[in-house]
Amino acid sequence: GITSINCSGDMWVEPGEIFQMGMNVSIYCQEALKHCRPRNLYFYKNGFKEEFDITRINRTTARIWYKGFSEPHAYMHCTAECPGHFQETLICGKDISSGHPPDAPSNLTCVIYEYSGNMTCTWNTGKPTYIDTKYIVHVKSLETEEEQQYLASSYVKISTDSLQGSRKYLVWVQAVNSLGMENSQQLHVHLDDIVIPSASIISRAETTNDTVPKTIVYWKSKTMIEKVFCEMRYKTTTNQTWSVKEFDANFTYVQQSEFYLEPDSKYVFQVRCQETGKRNWQPWSSPFVHQTSQETGKRNWQPWSSPFVHQTSQTVSQVTAKSSHEPQKMEMLSATIFRGHPASGNHQDIG
């Protein structure tokens, strides 16, 4: 569209230049040309001449009517056919937009990634609006009643320096566009409860050459949080189903987790952690691929007949991947849980 145009007349839109998608729209063109009594007034949409639903109201004015206009954006202009002129003469032009009022923002979540110095809030915006929509994030201290507001397009990062007067806040998001305004539900936030530990990383893995080979996975984090609860999921690259083990971790030293895995197979490992007792998880770490060594002796391998890792807390569950090509986007589809206990020899309790 053309933002600035010298008009020789006027163009206006009913109900307005921004309107709800699917509405009936009338666009008027009124010429004010010198030395021209136009034979015809023409409408163009995105450069193409319109043929239908045009009404000549009087000598200077014409109207085009659209039933259920549903294009998000269009550039309209109108011209006059002046006697004695070879070309049509431009009268005026307008950018028009159609869209929807915003949905109420949903699933508002605020977290502080350790060491980031920011509180990051995200939300679901709902269905597309097709028009410029802004989000106003309200952060109100429950202790001082002071309110801060931040403009955003899809998420917001708020410096924790500006949240020093209080630990408890009420957060909500207001969605605003030309067609309406909606508020999210309010979220109660305690700054101490929303910290996500510094990223956990799997650094290496090795498989021992024992008669019953075991794989040791080494993983670490720079977190300063003392009590951390973690999950490690793993599967063969050919499998859809993840197994998940749970650990209480202390990152003052590198974590070692032992697995008894199928020989001569390529495995994918990922880990994620949260502060113990809190609800916000890290995203899963980058996939770490490890190839187990070939079987040395003839052994009938069974996935659940081997001792588990020797860790303080562990749970193994089956998790099925939606797609083997999307290791980061997995959903818990089944919930068969196997609890491992520190084993002596090959004895295994399953409860």
Epitope: I136, E147, Q148, Q149, Y150, L151, A152, S162, Q174, V176
Partner: nanobody, 116 residues
Framework: QVQLQESGGGSVQAGGSLTLSCTAP????????MRWVRQAPGKGLEWVSG???????IYADSVKGRFTISKDNAKNTLYLQLNSLKTEDTAMYYC??????????GSQGTQVTVSS
Amino acid sequence: QVQLQESGGGSVQAGGSLTLSCTAPGFTFRLAAMRWVRQAPGKGLEWVSGIDSRGSTIYADSVKGRFTISKDNAKNTLYLQLNSLKTEDTAMYYCAQGVYGDTYSGSQGTQVTVSS
């Protein structure tokens, strides 16, 4: 309640420009989100523009591309630059706390009159 004070209004021809200011003694603009609202003769209050503590801005469609909101934290002052003024911009202009809303907190306002 913060006492806000607007200034800079006046009479101008259509197509002309003005800059409105809003100050508040003892008020820290650095952390504040602010807005401008206006009231045309015989009409209700209309939200015009807003700015958050970090300088992100939002505008009503009727003024987008013509008006610019800004603030100078060092001078504790909020501004509204009005360009390409139209007769329909004639109104009393008020500043208020908060990015968005068609209310103000009882300040005196500043009058803008645009003639054709």
